[in-house]
Amino acid sequence: CRTSECCFQDPPYPDADSGSASGPRDLRCYRISSDRYECSWQYEGPTAGVSHFLRCCLSSGRCCYFAAGSATRLQFSDQAGVSVLYTVTLWVESWARNQTEKSPEVTLQLYNSVKYEPPLGDIKVSKLAGQLRMEWETPDNQVGAEVQFRHRTPSSPWKLGDCGPQDDDTESCLCPLEMNVAQEFQLRRRQLGSQGSSWSKWSSPVCVPPENPPQPQVRFSVEQLGQDGRRRLTLKEQPTQLELPEGCQGLAPGTEVTYRLQLHMLSCPCKAKATRTLHLGKMPYLSGAAYNVAVISSNQFGPGLNQTWHIPADTHTEPVALNISVGTNGTTMYWPARAQSMTYCIEWQPVGQDGGLATCSLTAPQDPDPAGMATYSWSRESGAMGQEKCYYITIFASAHPEKLTLWSTVLSTYHFGGNASAAGTPHHVSVKNHSLDSVSVDWAPSLLSTCPGVLKEYVVRCRDEDSKQVSEHPVQPTETQVTLSGLRAGVAYTVQVRADTAWLRGVWSQPQRFSIEVQVSD
């Protein structure tokens, strides 16, 4: 027989299958051009001295063989004597070590057995009604296919699934979507309606994240507020990495989980932009304001659960950095300016009230005045800080107020609103005899004492009604009692107390008259 022909004679070896575990397997035969065909197979076991024979039986019952030698691939033409338009049965017999090993048979029509490719190029993955939808372009000239998929998770073996018949320029498959674990998918195709056609190779892995991205388990710490009024947010613990199936380890496009940091600046609600989203790797500097921080995990199917923290405001106060002058036209604040063209946000809220009741005002960008100060003024009619109570004031500054992470804290302090000098007047002044020439003066704490750092001191004034002599006694803001000594019996005195702030002299309390009775000896 000629080597190019299928030989219709008995093969040159005895006809007996050894039934050994090794041998030829996975025979695939295809048409590779208009008139040429190729069969290929795998051989399991030692290859030395092995001769392969491709056997073919026609529908008429006549059988022939091609001698392939040691090769595991053989090509022939439509002139080789093999019926290509009708079904034939093919198998491989391998003669080795005086025994014959036989592959499983394939029955097919060679002319219509086109070598099908697996899905090539970009496989688009999307979510559809709780399932996974994969879509790809049908390889050229291969419309009409059966498609299978296999999938595995990091802890499970391959499972096989069916995509059903496909008959279009694009093909698709609905597959199961896991809630909490990543999956690796591979797809393969074979010709539709072609009896016995071989499956293509498996496609490259398609790596699919779980439907729910893993909840980020991270911890933050916030550094102390620096001299520049900013504090760094640092990540104490990185998010855990998603466990991946074997074929997705290393480069696994599709399974990436991205973690984003969402900052919400709670303070200064009158600024233009309150939230900003950043990549988790880029840890920002924050002002001393209160923030809510959320870490949002997302994958190609969208965002998952987020983890939220509250970062409280830095309450460190600067008692002397803010000057407040109250005039007939209104009130003006002065503080050391940060730089040229700064926008300031002045926020105030009554002490002891919920943070949600904060009020604020945004200044236009301003340059320092000749004394290097920045200012903010308001009229009495505006009602700002108009009530006679303690307010907590924070001033923030930014050269780029639209950028949330560029705000810094200028100062935080307390201020007593309204007519502080009158409101702060101490009440319930009482005088008690202390000794033959001294008295103890007590009073109720000034309302100013509820405002940390505002009350500078009390001043107690004693007036001798006879000589009209006046003495004044400064008292620490934490004290509400003083002893006046060196007094004379039988003389009428009046005592008054006032409460002073750093920038305002208080109003004297109502005069309290007293005298030390003359002691008559027996």
Epitope: S83, V84, L85, Y86
Partner: nanobody, 124 residues
Framework: QVQLVESGGGLAQAGGSLRLSCAAS????????MAWFRQAPGKEREFVAH????????NYADSVKGRFTISRDNAKNTVYLQMTRLKPEDTAVYYC?????????????????WGPGTQVTVEP
């Protein structure tokens, strides 16, 4: 004497249609596999379509799949080739052939009986 005669060829515009017929005489062709081949100038004869004796199985060359349809009427001893969406590259002499051995091949030399052919010309 045994003979096959093709008809229906001619000039067609690209995108147009033609229907070729192959009438057999001299023997009963209803037991034979039938096929159409074509040969363009300077090229080898190439397989176009095949139909088995019962019209249960048909096969087409990739270049004509979806455009050409082979059929047969055994009572009339005739085989047809319906050609649609014609292209200039379909220009050739079309031959009808019979295979009484039912070998099922695309190799023209395996076919025993042949017609003289009919010219098909497709203009762009």
């Amino acid at each position: 004497q045994v003979q096959l005669v093709e008809s229906g060829g001619g000039l067609a515009q690209a995108g147009g249609s033609l229907r070729l017929s192959c009438a057999a005489s001299g023997r009963t062709f209803s037991n034979d596999d039938m096929a159409w081949f074509r040969q363009a100038p300077g090229k080898e004869r190439e397989f176009v379509a095949h139909i088995d004796r019962n019209a249960a199985s048909t096969n087409y060359a990739d270049s004509v799949k979806g455009r050409f349809t082979i059929s047969r009427d055994n009572a009339k001893n005739t085989v047809y080739l319906q050609m649609t969406r014609l292209k200039p590259e379909d220009t050739a002499v079309y031959y009808c052939a019979a295979d009484p051995d039912h070998f099922g091949t695309t190799w023209y030399q395996q076919y025993t009986y042949w017609g003289p052919g009919t010219q098909v010309t497709v203009e762009p």
